[in-house]
Amino acid sequence: ESALITQQDLAPQQRAAPQQKRSSPSEGLCPPGHHISEDGRDCISCKYGQDYSTHWNDLLFCLRCTRCDSGEVELSPCTTTRNTVCQCEEGTFREEDSPEMCRKCRTGCPRGMVKVGDCTPWSDIECVHKESGTKHSGEVPAVEETVTSSPGTPASPCSLSG
């Protein structure tokens, strides 16, 4: 199964500046951290902190580094081979449904419900009904969800789909 890579903004490159390293493509491809020249004869390095490429490629331009929004913290900076990794600040989270912004976690559960999961950068607090053990959404939670709160998934580059 393919790794599905989402569309990103191009970082326009002018004619390669003297400090940009050039090398020859291998099998028509350039290594991570580089893009290919228009004529396909040269690999040109991406600019550290400005743009990047993650795989062997024949991109005409490296990909523009993501800038973390206000309300996000930078876990790791952009390098020539890896995009910036951003994460929501403490007390906020990003849902898969609305990845464009960090939302404030709720401070507590509604009346008649008990907290079973903490606020993480990936999820709001989780509440279940005291009696029935059902989630706020009405779903019946898996047994482990009523016992522990998930630590969340590893942080990933916060580049958004285009």
């Epitope: 790794a3 599905l4 028509g28 491809l29 993650t54 062997w56 490629n57 331009f61």
Partner: nanobody, 126 residues
């Protein structure tokens, strides 16, 4: 921003033919190679074919070799996929892709792409 637009999908009987088109707007395709992937219902996205827009070198998945032909018209910024002898197992959403990504330089099959079209549905059924 690179934008890819597919067209040409539809319903066809087994043994029939279709031609898919992929047109690039914006700053052309953003890469030298352009390819096609497909995703059948309930399955992962798989590589179908690719073409080098500079010299016309072509690449095919074993499952479509001899039946599908990829071509390009650089003056129209368009890449085509001619699909002949279609089979029910070719039923899928077909995606045009650019900025193909490979784990190694010698690999013939990309693991993904930077730029994707919205997809066009091809249904092979009698």
């Amino acid at each position: 921003e690179v934008q890819l637009l597919e067209s040409g999908g539809g319903l066809v009987q087994p043994g029939g033919s279709l031609r898919l088109s992929c047109a690039a707007s914006g700053r052309t395709f953003g890469s030298i190679r352009v390819g096609w992937f497909r995703q059948a219902p309930g399955k992962g996205r798989e590589f179908v074919s690719a073409i080098n827009r500079n010299d016309g070198t072509t690449y095919y998945a074993d499952s479509v070799k001899g039946r599908f032909t990829i071509s390009r018209d650089n003056s129209k910024n368009t890449v085509y996929l001619q699909m002949n002898s279609l089979r029910p197992e070719d039923t899928a959403v077909y995606y045009c892709a650019a900025g193909l990504q490979y784990n190694r330089a010698a690999d013939r099959v990309p693991v993904g792409a930077v730029y994707w079209g919205q997809g066009t549905l091809v249904t092979v059924s009698s």
